[in-house]
Amino acid sequence: VKMAETCPIFYDVFFAVANGNELLLDLSLTKVNATEPERTAMKKIQDCYVENGLISRVLDGLVMTTISSSKDCMGEAVQNTVEDLKLNTLGR
Amino acid sequence: EICPAVKRDVDLFLTGTPDEYVEQVAQYKALPVVLENARILKNCVDAKMTEEDKENALSVLDKIYTSPLC
């Protein structure tokens, strides 16, 4: 189970913030109907990544990837899949 | 649906103390350079964002978690 499949819009926003690209951030925030104050708040987080440079973005991306692919998350994803299968079977 | 561990990480990034956030990161990646970077980013966010900003960021996260795209 790929991490982005569990909640693609979260990873779109996270990538846009960590990547430092305002155009991508705006586009992803549009898709969740973010308000102007919400956009301002997300841009402040984005500023921190930009100010701390490429290494900072890579390292934090590594953390997010590690958490998303950890047994805590993968176990959850597998459990959800099992539950879905049970429901589908019962549904028949 | 978003994984609870990811949700916890993001919540602590916004609302936790630097120590709480770094401790959470350490559970998954205990490299000194990673933990130092986590602390730098957390300190930066705390310095830049007002309480209202943090509430707005949490509001975005709520919208993300309840989105059909999640």
Epitope: N21, L23, L24, D26, L27, T30, N33, V50 | -
Partner: antibody
Amino acid sequence: EVQLVESGGGLAQPGGSLRLSCAASGFTFNNYAMTWVRQAPGKGLDWVSAISDSGRSTFSADSVKGRFTISRDNSKNTLYLQMDSLRAEDTALYYCAKHRNWNYPVFDYWGQGTLVTVSS
Amino acid sequence: DIQLTQSPSFLSASVGDRVTITCWASQGISSYLAWYQQKPGKAPKLLIYSASTLQSGVPSRFSGSGSGTEFTLTISSLQPEDFATYYCQQLNSYPFTFGPGTKVDIK
């Protein structure tokens, strides 16, 4: 009244360079992302490049990546397109356009265009 | 990149006709689609965004519909000033792309 006026087009040799400008007026320039769109003679519209309101972030079509650079000077209300390593297929009318707003980036105002011809 | 196709590419119609142009996206783009009108020698003009929202100042005879991968632009009663080329554009993801255009000509 919103106005966008392009300049800097002309004849260039293959491999040569040109710098296009777009002077903006009638709106708060530094509040809006901006875009360049081109149209080859008798052809359709081709999105080239966009830049965020602050000028910090850009995005370009693969066909121009590494050759064209979009930039802006918010103090001068001016958008630029630096075109290097020009090719014959870059021959087109180049339009600058304003994004409607950050949360729906359609192009609500366009300039009249400046013609770029690449030929030896 | 998301590809857009338009049908028809050329359309002959008379004043008063109801005209429909279709735009297909190569993948789902929700309602992130706009329509532009371009007359010869002029810059494009925004007609519709968000698939169905009419841009300020655009006559109500223009309407848009659709979501996902199929969209339509309808002109309820064609007027002499509507003879032009119409382009759809996706704004779901960068790079933004345009359809190839539909030329509406006088029959």
